[in-house]
């Protein structure tokens, strides 16, 4: 039943070219190169991709041709190492080229930058975009792949092909519409937001594999697939988990051709075996490949089988608990996780993994005890506080969100997290807290049964963003500790952090609080970010400021911006009123 067992091929590059087709092959090679060399100009990448493609075609024609037997890492690495400006542009990354495979590829992977120093993507006027699309559709779409891939070096490559297909469809439809902007802009906004979410979700999968290992990823996959496919038997779920782990290991390791090929095979297998997997797959399986794979990945949970028996009989009361644990630890724990997850679509995956970890720890201790059964008899009682903690947290935060609305809820989180980890850079605190705050509008609208999986698994994705950004420039031992100790306990670890009493407040700098008339032309979102940046800086200057003090200063600040943006001479207003505001704020906060 191994989906991925293939005959050995003389030429791996020819094999993948034939499997994927020229269009997907070229797109995936471009994504791979842009994710590795994030600073290289578009034209350079296109040239490299064309050279690789021409080479692949010679191998398709004759698999025995020179160099066709080389591994994809060797071929792609050699090609990347021909870039003339490698040392000037990338510094020590150029040293990777002195290494042999597989060390060279590992070296490239280690130099992927989650926060590359690239300009923000500015959206041109609709007419300009439509002209560019019509003038050269192929280049226009390649540019999209390139710009997303270089900014998101772990973006799930086969899924990026799906985004590009939707991007093309949006332009094809809207550039012919009477009101191009009304048609196109909402579609581009949706793609941007979905793309950011997709990138962040995949980043967590890669972090899970790379920082915590295959076992951690497989545990996550068992829990999630068991919730999604509760009618599938454990053997089926195990097979899907093995195959899915291979796909994500490949994509996270830069093996994008193999990853896309194997993902297509997995979608094919799932659709051929729907009857033993899920009743919800029918519509997905009627779609073309890219849509099909996306649809399967997002498919709703199937209904739980009726009358599932109690877990206690097999996992607590049975005489064979310790025998099972001793004979096949991971399989037995996998079965426990499968059985628990399929009964609890209302739990977050991370909660299910905490329960499985508690069960494992208990058996580890009890199976060595004089009376194992007596020792582990009450193990399910230990689950109660673990379940109640996220339930209570979500209840409290949804109440706060409903009371404040998204912007003010984000501000509350900004203050909370700046006090916990004030050493973290202001842009990171703003970005992460804004995303944490979005949990409200994303999840609080759901009924109780869907709130926890929505909220806590989303928070895991956002906190991983904090972890990967912080890893690049570590500044806080507390962040490092919460990020590295346990993948499933990251959120409880951050929740448990109190105000950092060791933090020495930042020196006051008036420049940080000096604003200009350009703020008036910003979008509402950009204006919010400016205000939230100021709020973080305030807390860094005065970590002991009360909510009331901060609210008063922020209200004054909002009034100041509103007043000066209505003034005839905006710049003068910002200069004069700004000085007054800074003085008043210093007085209010006792700075």
């Amino acid at each position: 039943r191994g989906v991925f067992r293939r005959d050995a091929h003389k030429s791996e590059v020819a094999h993948r070219f034939k499997d994927l087709g020229e269009e997907n092959f070229k797109a995936l090679v471009l994504i791979a190169f842009a994710q590795y060399l994030q600073q290289c100009p578009f034209e350079d990448h296109v040239k490299l991709v064309n050279e690789v493609t021409e080479f692949a075609k010679t191998c398709v024609a004759d698999e025995s041709a020179e160099n066709c037997d080389k591994s994809l890492h060797t071929l792609f690495g050699d090609k990347l190492c021909t870039v003339a400006t490698l040392r000037e542009t990338y510094g020590e990354m150029a040293d990777c080229c002195a290494k042999q495979e597989p060390e060279r590829n590992e070296c490239f992977l280690q130099h992927k930058d989650d926060n590359p120093n690239l300009p923000r993507l500015v959206r041109p006027e609709v007419d300009v975009m439509c002209t560019a699309f019509h003038d050269n559709e192929e280049t226009f779409l390649k540019k999209y792949l390139y710009e997303i891939a270089r900014r998101h070096p772990y973006f799930y490559a086969p899924e990026l092909l799906f985004f590009a297909k939707r991007y093309k469809a949006a332009f094809t439809e809207c550039c012919q519409a009477a009101d191009k902007a009304a048609c196109l802009l909402p579609k581009l906004d949706e793609l941007r937001d979905e793309g950011k979410a997709s990138s962040a979700k995949q980043r967590l999968k890669c972090a899970s594999l790379q920082k915590f290992g295959e076992r951690a990823f497989k545990a996550w996959a068992v829990a999630r697939l068991s919730q999604r496919f509760p009618k599938a038997e454990f053997a089926e779920v195990s097979k899907l988990v093995t195959d899915l782990t291979k796909v994500h290991t490949e994509c996270c390791h830069g093996d994008l051709l193999e990853c896309a090929d194997d993902r297509a095979d997995l979608a094919k297998y799932i659709c051929e075996n729907q009857d033993s997997i899920s009743s919800k797959l029918k519509e997905c399986c009627e779609k073309p490949l890219l849509e099909k794979s996306h649809c399967i990945a997002e498919v709703e949970n199937d209904e739980m089988p009726a009358d599932l028996p109690s877990l206690a009989a097999d996992f607590v009361e049975s005489k064979d608990v310790c025998k099972n644990y001793a004979e096949a630890k991971d399989v037995f724990l996998g079965m426990f996780l499968y059985e628990y997850a399929r009964r609890h679509p209302d739990y977050s995956v991370v909660l299910l993994l905490r329960l499985a970890k508690t069960y494992e720890t208990t058996l580890e201790k009890c199976c060595a005890a004089a009376d194992p059964h007596e020792c582990y008899a009450k193990v399910f009682d230990e689950f109660k506080p673990l379940v109640e903690e996220p339930q209570n947290l979500i209840k409290q935060n949804c109440e706060l969100f409903e009371q404040l609305g998204e912007y003010k809820f984000q501000n509350a989180l900004l203050v909370r997290y700046t006090k916990k980890v004030p050493q973290v850079s202001t842009p990171t605190l703003v970005e992460v807290s804004r995303n944490l705050g979005k949990v409200g509008s994303k999840c609080c609208k759901h009924p109780e049964a869907k709130r926890m999986p929505c909220a806590e698994d989303y928070l895991s994705v956002v906190l991983n963003q904090l972890c990967v950004l912080h890893e690049k420039t570590p500044v806080s031992d507390r962040v490092t500790k919460c990020c590295t100790e346990s993948l499933v306990n990251r959120r409880p670890c951050f929740s448990a952090l109190e105000v950092d009493e060791t933090y020495v407040p930042k020196e006051f700098n008036a420049e940080t609080f000096t604003f200009h008339a350009d703020i008036c032309t910003l979008s509402e979102k950009e204006r919010q970010i400016k205000k939230q940046t100021a709020l973080v800086e305030l807390v860094k200057h005065k970590p002991k400021a009360t909510k009331e003090q901060l609210k008063a200063v922020m209200d004054d600040f909002a009034a100041f911006v509103e007043k000066c943006c209505k003034a005839d001479d905006k710049e003068t207003c910002f200069a004069e009123e700004g000085k007054k505001l800074v003085a008043a704020s210093q007085a209010a906060l006792g700075l």
Epitope: E233, F234, A235, L308, D320, N324, E327, V331, M335
Partner: nanobody
Framework: QVQLVESGGGLVKPGGSLRLSCAAS????????AAWFRQAPGKEREFVSA???????TYADSVKGRFTISRDNAKNSLYLQMNSLRAEDTAVYYC?????????????????WGQGTLVTVSS
């Protein structure tokens, strides 16, 4: 609790074939190890074959190559296809199940048993 009921036994000539079935009820047993044992008149009950959650099968040397164990989890059933039957295969055949990841070969490891079905191989 799991209840097991065997069927399919009977009289067959040497060299013939039979297919035994075992229907489980009370709870799904797809993750359980399941096995066939047999007891000839005046002899100890002996292991014939077992199958685990992964559908990995093991056999007693005396039946290897002739008997095939299988399971249909959708039907919550276990089967034993017996070919090239010999007189010495005559016995009462029992179906057994236990929640074990690795399928045991010892009768004392099994928690649930059927009542048995008689197989007679005679010309």
């Amino acid at each position: 609790q799991v209840q097991l009921v065997e069927s399919g036994g009977g009289l067959v000539k040497p060299g013939g074939s039979l297919r035994l079935s075992c229907a489980a009820s009370g709870r799904p047993v797809s993750n359980y190890a399941a096995a066939w044992f047999r007891q000839a008149p005046g002899k100890e009950r002996e292991f014939v074959s077992a199958i685990n959650w992964q559908k990995t099968a093991t056999y007693a040397d005396s039946v290897k190559g002739r008997f095939t164990i299988s399971r249909d989890n959708a039907k919550n059933s276990l089967y034993l296809q017996m070919n090239s039957l010999r007189a010495e295969d005559t016995a009462v055949y029992y179906c057994a199940a236990v929640f074990r990841v690795v399928a045991p070969k010892t009768q004392y490891d099994y928690d649930y048993w059927g009542q048995g079905t008689l197989v007679t191989v005679s010309s």
